[in-house]
């Protein structure tokens, strides 16, 4: 089939990085500057994407592949091929389908990326909560309740009943 096709259509012999030039008896011509063809047999080359403004060049355009963009610091890509840039979330938030959402009670995120994770359950290790958790920080576990001086008490919050990374929409 390939051989038959190439007999019928000389353009099928043109490799990636070239185009089949109708103005020159269907000779395979190299893609002009700032253009590319990622597959063989193309009759035109595509214009290279330019990464401008909030978009930065991650990979330069070549004769066989388009440029790839990412986002300037403080932003991250959305969409196929980084078509949009979205502001990074704050600490204490996670990125959901609807954008940045505060961590639910009992979870935290100490970074500007990623998901909210449940606070450590100190009681699982036989310890007590020394410092309470926040949206931005995990709890700090201290000595086990038995190790505490008489009269001292500590409250260990129940482990949150949610899967890590799940956030109500």
């Amino acid at each position: 089939f390939e051989r038959t096709r190439s007999l019928q259509d000389p353009c099928s012999n043109c490799p990636a990085g070239t185009f089949c030039d109708n103005n020159r008896n269907q000779i395979c011509s190299p893609c002009p500057p700032n253009s590319f063809s990622s597959a063989g047999g193309q009759r035109t080359c595509d214009i290279c994407r330019q990464c401008k403004g909030v978009f930065r060049t991650r990979k330069e355009c070549s004769s066989t592949s388009n440029a790839e963009c990412d986002c300037t610091p403080g932003f991250h890509c959305l969409g196929a091929g980084c078509s949009m840039c979205e502001q990074d979330c704050k600490q204490g938030q996670e990125l959901t389908k609807k954008g940045c959402k505060d961590c639910c009670f009992g979870t935290f995120n100490d970074q500007k990326r990623g998901i909210c994770r449940p606070w450590t359950n100190c009681s699982l290790d036989g310890k007590s909560v020394l410092v309470n958790g926040t949206k931005e920080r995990d709890v700090v576990c201290g000595p086990s309740p038995a190790d505490l001086s008489p009269g001292a008490s500590s409250v260990t919050p129940p482990a949150p009943a949610r899967e890590p990374g799940h956030s109500p929409q």
Partner: antibody
């Protein structure tokens, strides 16, 4: 906070030019493309073009290509849109807007009235 | 150019109503669809970007959905401040193009 403040309303004669300014504050002006959108009375929104303040590179809507010039002065965080050979159907509100692949912040708009 | 067809062009609704506005693109825009609100004074505000992501400060009664060529903006319970004109806009290709707008009026 991020803000775009545009120049005031203009009344200009047919055949003349108008230059609208858009001053940005609250972010790094050079780091984001600025787009211009217009809206004729009672009509929808129409994209005119964009400028990358860092390089001065522009993309214009073919409809305005021969009449519009977009420039930017990074030293004063201001973008400009100049439209020449004005006609009565260029009467519209002109908006500047910051681009992230979506227009997250808009200027308040500048009404340009073309009238003899 | 990618054509954006918005419907309806206007609608009348009451406070508390659920309102749905649709936007159809002339070709696949791969979820690169944004929604804006324009109040009578002229101010334009971003509501939703990338089909379904709520812009900061926008109430959760606004939501977006869709894929390919068909997209929807929904207001789950219309509030007095929501009476305005809504525009969709594609960011898939230059030139950026907008729908014709939907004016939401008080019934």
């Amino acid at each position: 906070q991020v803000q775009l403040v545009q120049s005031g309303a203009e009344v200009v004669k047919p055949g003349a030019s108008v230059k609208v300014s858009c001053k940005a504050s609250g972010y790094t002006f050079a780091g984001f493309e600025m787009h211009w959108v217009r809206q004729a009375p009672g009509q929808g929104l129409g994209w005119m073009g964009a400028i990358d303040p860092k390089t001065g590179g522009t993309d214009y809507n073919q409809k305005f290509k021969d009449r519009v010039t977009m420039t930017a002065d990074t030293s004063i965080s201001t973008a400009y849109m100049e439209l020449s050979r004005l006609r009565s159907d260029d009467t519209a509100v002109y908006y500047c807007t910051r681009d992230l692949g979506y227009f997250d912040v808009w200027g308040q708009g500048t009404l340009v009235t073309v009238s003899s | 150019d990618i054509q954006m067809t918005q419907s309806p062009s206007s609608l009348s609704a009451s406070v508390g109503d659920r309102v749905t506005i649709t936007c159809r693109a002339s070709q696949d825009i791969r979820s690169n669809l944004n929604w804006y609100q324009q109040k009578p004074g002229g101010a334009v505000k971003l509501l939703i970007y990338y089909t379904s992501r709520l812009h900061s400060g926008v109430p959760s009664r606004f939501s977006g959905s869709g894929s390919g060529t068909d997209y929807t903006l929904t207001i789950s319970s219309l509030q007095p401040e929501d009476f305005a004109t809504y525009f969709c806009q594609q960011s898939e290709k230059l030139p950026r193009t907008f729908g014709g707008g939907t004016k939401v009026e008080i019934r």
